[in-house]
């Protein structure tokens, strides 16, 4: 498997419609919680919680502040922490508690605290519970949490120094935690937690399970340096701890190694960055997508592996355990345990079989089972990815977060669309296409290239968005920018399962699964653009330039996978001559303009898709070069800003089916005024201008017209 290619399209922040939310002097918007039924997005930031309209996050509905007192700040600073940054209250837990309240925890100047937020009044109840074990002390420390039936399961550090890791359940009747022992947790960096509900039709009275994902220092591999290992661990929701052994400790805590590697190249991805659990009506068992980087990542490598949850469950239910053995100089080595395994199976949830044997609760489990799981929390078998290889490996990028959406293309094929954020504020959208990865697009979510700290996907049909949180704010982006593809070819070549070309409206439209009639829409996930209707017209942009100047003709080909070439009249231009130059690989520069340069210029693009090359005419320009005797006083000119040039004449364009959108204005770099020529007729056409173009000093003038294209294939 090769490295993933560059994104086909790069959308700059200003090019697409992104909705933003940020409040002055508020930072670290890292906790996001979506209430789909209320269309509300809850945002936990530093010292504040906000409620915003999930359909338009710039609309703030409520806000509440949870600041640290000066006294607490001072005490924190005395312990050597920064008063300006660390000794504040970073919201780290934002979980639903009931229909009317949220459970919120913050670092609270290194004295973690939790409270209940009433959603009606949007005020804290002032419970000020101790957040130890639920929320980290240090805002820089890792954490994860999930609320399951009113009980908070969390993975974080339990002390000021962050040296005691803990996976715990905060419960009034049965609080549980991990053993503070290296075999259980060895300097973990917590990434994600989620509950997997038992299957409703499960015959064996199974229990719900809570899964934790983290990276920790390996106990089983000993090298000169510390080897990091990605882990999946799970506990049973019904666990009540042991009666004597493992009292108030998990009796069901088991962990296994997650494998994500490229065997052919020896590339091992062993640092877990994020996890997303994909649940879909078509999936019997959830699939989880995990995002990794290698431990020594000097080249910026990232990988995504996908796993069937059943594979992990198989390891925990039937896999071999590891055990530690002491070798010379009291050195501990972990090896596969091949001895007898007590019954009931250590670490197993209480199911019908256990109940039939009179083990109705973990409190009834025999000491042998409990002692075994206490000493053998690590499985020898590893959890391997689907197809035994990564779904995606990308070079020169550090991915930070992942969300995945399962969607159906027009032909019924199901695609898992991966939305992966980067440490430079961008979002990549990728799919697997015929055993290769296609990165549909890259969107610059944050203008100042800051890391994306959290990603959230809305699952409501119709209005679908991705929400991204960073240090400076939250950005809301649609799942696709279909409308930005101006031609049928562009729409098809995007190979975006969310988009299809609508011939009646000559637009690229978003496919919403709820809207049924898709008749007549064109979508070819193979990228075969020959299915597109022939273009009968193409718009020409006309320009008048001063003799001796320089012209830049725009070619607005957005695809990073396309190459362009230019034609003048019937000849193909090479931009390596003294006469021509290429600007940004796409735009044509024509130097030292003379009358001989007047005529029709076309920019054609070629894009290879699966050993097929798609050619299309992207831009057409009619250039008229005039010798200017003297300046002319110009009437008032309507001026608009256009991307790519500072000023341009305003031109009204009637769009034609399948035609390229008019390219942005071409700006003359020569100085001097321009006289209006007498009704120019562009080469090869009798089409005359229908509008009068005003002229202004320092600017060439232009207009748009339509010419029949005789040789489109």
């Amino acid at each position: 498997m090769a490295f993933a290619p560059i994104p086909r399209i790069t959308w700059e922040h200003r090019e697409v419609h992104l909705v933003q939310f940020h409040e002055p002097d508020i930072y670290n918007y890292s906790a996001l919680l979506l209430s789909e039924d209320k269309d509300t997005l809850y945002i936990g930031a530093r010292e504040a919680v906000f409620a915003v309209n999930a359909l338009n996050i710039s609309e703030k509905q409520h806000e509440v502040y949870w600041k640290v007192s000066e006294d607490k700040k001072a005490k924190c600073a005395e312990k050597g922490k920064s008063k300006q940054t660390e000794c504040l209250n970073y919201i780290r837990v934002l979980q639903p508690l009931s229909a009317t309240s949220l459970y919120v925890c913050g670092t609270n100047a290194f004295q973690p605290a939790c409270d209940h937020l009433n959603l009606t009044s949007f005020k804290f109840l002032g419970k000020n519970e101790d957040g130890k074990g639920r929320c980290p002390f240090d805002p820089a420390h890792s954490y994860t949490s999930v609320m399951v039936d009113g009980e908070l399961y969390s993975g974080t550090s339990y002390n000021f120094l962050g040296s005691e890791p803990i996976i715990s359940r905060n419960s009034s009747h049965s609080p549980l935690r991990t053993e503070y022992a290296i075999p259980w947790l060895n300097e973990p960096s917590f990434v994600f937690a989620d509950v997997i509900r038992k299957s409703p039709d499960s015959p064996d009275g199974e229990d719900d399970r809570v899964y934790f994902f983290f990276t920790e220092v390996s106990v089983e591999y000993e090298f000169v340096f510390r080897v990091l290992i990605p882990r999946i661990a799970r506990v049973c929701k019904g666990d009540q701890g042991g009666l004597r052994t493992l009292q108030k400790k998990w009796t069901s805590f088991l962990k296994a190694r997650l494998i994500c590697s490229r065997p052919d190249s020896g590339l091992v991805f062993n640092v877990l960055r994020d996890v997303f659990v994909l649940r879909s009506p078509g999936l019997k068992v959830p699939v989880f997508y995990a995002l990794f980087t290698p431990q020594l990542n000097n080249v910026g490598l990232s990988a995504v592996c996908a796993y069937n949850l059943s594979t992990a469950e198989e390891v925990f239910s039937h896999g071999k355990y590891m055990q530690s053995t002491t070798v010379e100089q009291s050195h501990t080595k972990w090896v596969r345990y091949n001895g007898p395994v007590p019954k009931p199976r250590p670490g197993a949830c209480i199911d019908s079989e256990a109940r039939a044997a009179n083990y109705t609760s973990s409190l009834n489990l025999p000491d042998k089972t409990l002692q075994f799981v206490k000493d053998h929390p690590l499985m020898d078998d590893s959890v391997t990815p689907i197809d035994n290889r990564p779904r995606l490996i990308k070079k020169d990028v550090n991915y930070t977060q992942i969300v995945v959406d399962r969607t159906q293309a027009l032909d019924g094929t199901v695609y898992d669309v991966m939305f992966v954020s980067t440490d430079r504020g961008a979002l990549h959208k990728a799919i697997s296409l015929e055993h290769a990865v296609h990165i549909i697009e890259e969107t610059q979510l944050f203008q100042d290239f800051e890391p994306v700290q959290t990603l959230l996907l809305s699952s409501k049909k119709g209005n679908r968005f991705v929400y991204a949180g960073s240090n400076s704010g939250v950005v809301q982006a649609p799942l696709a920018f279909c409308g930005k593809h101006g031609t049928c070819e562009d729409c098809v070549l995007a190979r975006d399962p969310y988009c299809a070309w609508s011939p009646p409206t000559a637009t690229c439209v978003a496919l919403h699964q709820t809207e049924s009639p898709s008749r007549g829409l064109i979508q070819e996930m193979s990228g075969d653009a020959s299915v597109c209707p022939d273009k009968s017209k193409g718009s020409y942009r006309q320009h008048f330039f001063k003799h001796g100047g320089t012209a830049e003709l725009k070619c607005s080909q957005k695809s990073n996978l396309a190459r362009v070439f230019w034609k003048f009249q019937n000849g193909v231009l090479k931009a390596e001559s003294p006469k021509y130059g290429l600007m940004g690989r796409k735009n044509l520069l024509i130097f030292n303009l003379s009358e001989g340069d007047s005529g029709v210029y076309q920019c054609l693009s070629e894009e290879r898709v699966k050993n097929k090359t798609v050619f299309q005419v992207v831009a057409k320009h009619v250039l008229e070069v005039k010798v200017v005797p003297k300046p002319v006083v110009a009437p008032t000119l309507s001026v608009v800003q256009t991307e790519g040039s500072r000023i341009a004449t305003k031109v009204l364009v009637a769009s034609t089916q399948g035609s390229s959108p008019p390219t942005p204005a071409v700006q003359a770099t020569s100085s001097g005024a321009i006289t209006l020529p007498p009704k120019p007729a562009p080469t090869g056409t009798s089409c005359e201008p229908k509008i009068v173009i005003n002229t202004v000093p320092q600017l060439h003038s232009e207009k748009t017209m339509y010419l029949k294209s005789s040789d489109n294939r």
């Epitope: 019937n570 000849g571 193909v572 070629e606 097929k612 090359t613 005789s710 294939r713």
Partner: antibody
Framework: EVQLQQSGPVLVKPGASVKISCKAS????????MNWVKQSHGKSLEWIGD????????SYNQKFKGKATLTVDRSSSTAYMEFRSLTSEDSAVYYC????????????WGQGTSVTVSS | DIVLTQSPASLAVSLGQRATISCRAS??????????MHWYQQKPGQPPKLLIY???NLESGVPARFSGSGSETDFTLNIHTVEEEDAATYFC?????????FGGGTKVEIK
Amino acid sequence: EVQLQQSGPVLVKPGASVKISCKASGYTFTDYYMNWVKQSHGKSLEWIGDINPDNGFTSYNQKFKGKATLTVDRSSSTAYMEFRSLTSEDSAVYYCARDGSSAYGMDYWGQGTSVTVSS
Amino acid sequence: DIVLTQSPASLAVSLGQRATISCRASESVSIHGTHLMHWYQQKPGQPPKLLIYAASNLESGVPARFSGSGSETDFTLNIHTVEEEDAATYFCQQSIEEPRTFGGGTKVEIK
């Protein structure tokens, strides 16, 4: 001045593999595809495939799929072609040639690398 | 694959005379008015050299006595007044689809 400098001639045994290099200079390496072309003694030219150095995308002639592997090292502006499981049929001169677009043709060629497969 | 058939296979021309080489494609190599056919010259022990690109465009540094024409499936390379140094094998090549293919070559000898 644009130059494509290929590695020297090689003599290999049947079943072995060979890796030919093509070092580009005088232009921006990532702006042009690199093509590889085979010319058997006294015969015409056969296109093996090409690679886009910008993103590593490759396209192969079906006839050479599984036989040839094209790679690039952007840091040294060098393109490589590895030929595996060599037989006497693979004895030929192999050229690298750049192209800036399908409309431009292959405007600069390496001097060629002679590969002889013999036991 | 697109098959390119060159004719004649060899050609003997007198100095100063005109030489015409034909190349026929098994399917059209033209799109949007662009004809994706190129011509190369190869001398013994040397790599091919690009003469004409996109059917009729003279490559920089190539003498003006070389010209190309044609569209769709039929293309021609002309050497208007043959010189001694033009003795070589000439190949046509299409780039409208993969695999790129070459003609069988035409050997030009000077009489």
